[in-house]
């Protein structure tokens, strides 16, 4: 018979800190004893339990380093069969924050929503949306990706979307929610957070609450992850640089700065296509970089670094819809 793998997908995604089992089975037609084993080509295998005709690979407390290519090799006599499974490890804890925590009708026009401690952070996997009632507001004004302060070997990100709100000046403003969705092969997970809309500026908190609670709405297809534990907050975090963007003639200006007191400097260390393609200016704790928006504009990671200390800040810019090159 064929070599059977459960789950049958060629890509299996597991949440960070979660567990997953991959089972490989083979039966031989001629009553010969089959041989089945898992091999990790580029990763440590985890725990493997094999007996005649089956092999079970168990991944517990998955970290990003558990990701990789696993091959199940089965044989019946001289016939050898193989199946490859790519294990992905993602992080998507229920850690959504919104700013402001409550909106004042007629006054607040912009809202930001941030998903914390996630990976991957690219738009194809992680989408952020703002829901007004059951209607999704259009494209975000901007999307920013920054590295979280590193805790252990796993590099995680915070992704922030910003939206401009329509007028909320109706007798009963519709409910406002921020939703984050992680989509990977075999996995679709969503978290949602309500943003209270206040009628007037008497209080920033809705009556009867201390702070708006997250309202997770978890839906998953073909996934059996254990939820990842929330990342611990470290109180004494080192001083970190931050990247700000502002529009400039013909493009964007990025400012990397660190408010860490005297004796520190920041500098740009990475940009799509190489730093030499950009105009830069550095002055102690501030460094500027000009991003032209000709054609599609650059797409990729901009990174700056703090010295001394080596802390990094990163920003991922998505290329905008292409404007055709200006006529000569």
């Amino acid at each position: 018979g064929p070599l059977e793998v459960e789950p049958p997908d060629s890509v299996v995604a597991v949440s960070m800190g979660g567990s997953r089992q991959l089972t490989c089975r083979l039966s031989c037609a001629d009553h010969r004893a089959p041989s089945v084993q898992w091999r990790g080509l580029d990763t440590s295998l985890g725990a493997v339990r094999s007996d005649a005709g089956s092999s079970v690979l168990s991944v517990h407390n998955a970290s990003l380093s558990a990701a990789g290519t696993h091959v199940c090799v089965g044989s019946c006599g001289n016939l050898t069969l193989q199946r490859t499974v790519q294990l992905l490890v993602f992080a998507f804890p229920d850690q959504l924050t919104v700013s402001p925590v409550a909106l004042v009708a007629k006054q607040d026009r912009e809202v930001a929503c941030t998903a914390h401690n996630v990976t991957p952070a690219s738009p194809e996997a992680l989408s952020l949306s703002l829901l007004l009632g059951d209607r999704e507001l259009g494209e975000a004004l901007s999307r920013e990706v920054e590295e979280e302060p590193q805790q252990g070997e796993d590099l995680l990100f915070q992704v922030t979307g910003r939206w401009l709100l329509p007028s909320l000046d109706t007798p009963t403003p519709p409910a406002l929610h921020c939703r984050a969705t992680m989509t990977l092969p075999g996995v679709q997970l969503s978290h949602q957070r309500a943003i209270p809309v206040l009628r007037s500026l008497t209080s920033r908190e809705p009556p009867g609450t201390t702070s708006p609670e997250a309202t997770p709405e978890l839906s998953s297809t073909r996934s059996s992850e254990s939820p990842a534990p929330p990342a611990g907050n470290s109180s004494a975090r080192p001083c970190r640089p931050k990247i700000h963007q502002s529009p400039a003639a013909g493009g964007l200006e990025l400012l990397c700065e660190a408010a860490c007191g005297p004796g520190v400097a920041v500098g740009w260390t990475q940009a799509p296509g190489g730093l030499e393609a950009y105009q830069r200016r550095e002055a102690g704790a501030q460094a500027w970089l000009s991003v032209p928006r000709a054609g599609c504009g650059p797409e990729g990671w901009f990174q700056c670094r703090l010295d001394p200390g080596g802390q990094m800040a990163s920003l991922y810019l998505v290329a905008e819809v292409c404007s055709p090159p200006a006529p000569p």
């Epitope: 997908d9 990003l64 990701a67 990976t119 991957p120 194809e124 990100f157 989509t183 990671w301 991922y316």
Partner: antibody, heavy 124, light 114 residues
Framework: QVQLQESGPGLVKPSETLSLTCTVS????????WSWIRQPAGKGLEWIGR???????NSNPSLRGRVTILADTSKNQFSLKLSSVTAADTAVYYC??????????????????WGQGTLVTVSS | DIVMTQSPDSLAVSLGERATINCKSS????????????LAWYQQKPRQPPKLLIY???IREYGVPDRFSGSGSGTDFTLTISSLQAEDVAVYFC??????????FGGGTKVEIK
Amino acid sequence: QVQLQESGPGLVKPSETLSLTCTVSGDSISSNYWSWIRQPAGKGLEWIGRIYTSGGTNSNPSLRGRVTILADTSKNQFSLKLSSVTAADTAVYYCARDRITIIRGLIPSFFDYWGQGTLVTVSS
Amino acid sequence: DIVMTQSPDSLAVSLGERATINCKSSQSVLYSSNNKTYLAWYQQKPRQPPKLLIYWASIREYGVPDRFSGSGSGTDFTLTISSLQAEDVAVYFCQQYYSIPPLTFGGGTKVEIK
């Protein structure tokens, strides 16, 4: 065994749209990422773009605006449309399965299964 | 874009001898956080599609003969065929997958028998 097979017209007129389909067997297109790659005669390989689980796409910025990649999960197929073609688009077009990984929050890939390729000539 | 440059363009080696192909990236494809190098090698025989040989710069794809090996880190990489066989006559390509979009390939190196 995973198999991919490209199909579509071998001849396209300049300024028209090139359309190709890739039929996949041995794997579900909804459980992976899938790419189109092309190779002009005697030249190197150029990644065109890919489609992924959520139905979204990435494409090569050098072709941006001309590339559309769609999936039909009911037929286990994905397709490529390349608009406004010129003679420079003459090439063997391959579909391939991405082996994806996660790095720096991105999802790059290399290619572990390829179709046999189909030659598309752009000529009037 | 990360530009991948291969050398030489072609190479003639006697059967049983060592063949060495080089690939250089315009920026580092080594990710220091996990110490992985995001580079793959492919073999393309005449009238066939490319076949994956090596990824992470040095991991052989399952079923690839052990005479093929990959090495290098950062920006300079090498594919070595330790003892060339007749069936190894092909064009070999490197590919970076550190940065997307786009994923980029080298121009190819043609290996022939001397």
